[in-house]
């Protein structure tokens, strides 16, 4: 059985221009993490592998740095950058969990940080 | 120019080990991955394991997993993947790639490995 | 592990016609996936990387698409030098598995 939960940064909002930290963090599970995906919309970030390391898709190593931790960094975010964001959660023997971060970029300079709140986890088996 | 050159082929008796080499220039080898991948004949390709050259982190097949070893060599610029207990189902072509955001941009020529008693 | 399904595998096409093939994921990839061609006596080459970004110094009649699961590799205008077999491959998560192939021939 699944135990684990995925806490995430939530509902974020940052400035056209900057920058935001994604974070997710999965608790309540003995499960090793073998590798977590960032994934936006229908494209694949980066990938921290547990063996392996960082690596950063080609078409955005100009602007995703990785970390802190487990974490991403975006940077010159544009208007574009607006939606939702998934960190991906491979781990055995659990399988799948996914946690949901939506990201609005602001043209103003009120942009606030959402509070931090736990979702239920989207799981699937290996 | 990045090149990947790999050792000659084999012919190896089952029950033995063998050591196939690929020799990386032409870029900073600790910057990207090695990836090995096999074909045996009529098969399709075969991913087999992976080294990051910078770190030493490994990471192989499952069904690989106690049979085959990959290390690399930073001072050469040498990868290597050994892989022991050779039955006959491993008589393949064993290809090493340059692993760029794990897929694979560059391929070695291909090492012919022969199992037969 | 992530099974990839191809098809067809085979095809036959006229010179200068289009050529499809199709890639299935067993389960979700986002855009992780990546298209080789193989020629016989040569090693695999890479032609398409994060489903659609095509790599460097590969001509633009070859075009990759899709997410998720479903993913397409298709040569706009087929030429006697793409005779090969064709491989996805996804670059989701380990072990990193290829689909079974597909054979493109000149009808």
């Known amino acids: 059985m699944m135990t684990g939960t995925i806490e995430t940064t939530g509902n974020i909002s940052a400035e056209k221009g900057g920058s935001i930290i994604l974070q997710c963090h999965l608790s309540s599970t003995t499960a090793q993490v073998t590798q977590v995906n960032w994934e936006q919309q229908d494209q694949l970030l980066a990938i921290c592998n547990a063996d392996l390391g960082w690596h950063i898709s080609p078409s955005f190593k100009d602007r995703v740095a990785p970390g802190p931790g487990l974490g991403l960094t975006l940077q010159s975010l544009t208007v574009n950058d607006t939606g939702e964001y998934f960190c991906i959660y491979h781990t055995y023997p659990d399988g799948t969990y996914t946690g949901r971060i939506f990201l609005e970029v602001l043209e103003s300079s009120v942009a606030e940080h959402g509070a931090r709140f736990q979702i239920p986890h989207h799981h699937h088996h290996h | 120019e990045v090149q990947l050159v790999q050792s000659g082929a084999e012919v190896k008796k089952p029950g033995a080990s063998v050591k196939v080499s690929c020799k990386a220039s032409g870029y900073a080898f600790t910057n990207y991955l090695i990836e090995w991948v096999r074909q045996a004949p009529g098969q399709r390709l075969e991913w087999m394991g992976v080294i990051n050259p910078g770190s030493g982190g490994t990471n192989y097949k499952e069904k690989f997993k106690g049979r085959v070893t990959i290390t690399a060599d930073k001072s050469s610029s040498t990868a290597y993947m050994e892989l022991s207990s050779l039955r006959s189902e491993d008589t393949a072509v064993y290809y090493c790639a340059r692993g760029e955001y794990f897929f694979f941009d560059y391929w070695g020529q291909g090492t012919t490995v022969t199992v037969s008693s | 592990d992530i099974v990839m399904t191809q098809s067809p595998d085979s095809l036959a096409v006229s010179l200068g016609e289009r050529a499809t093939i199709n890639c299935k994921a067993s389960?979700?990839?986002?855009?992780?996936v990546a298209w080789y061609q193989h020629k016989p006596g040569q090693s695999p080459k890479l032609l398409i990387y994060s489903a659609s970004y095509r790599y460097t110094g590969v001509p633009d009649r070859f075009s990759g698409s899709g997410s998720g699961t479903d993913f397409t590799l298709t040569i706009s205008s087929l030429q006697a030098e793409d005779v090969a077999v064709y491989y996805c491959?996804?670059?989701?998560?380990?072990?990193?598995?290829f689909g079974g192939g597909t054979k493109v021939e000149i009808k």
């Open positions: 491959q996804q670059h989701y998560n380990t072990p990193h598995t």
């Open positions: 389960q979700h990839v986002s855009d992780g």
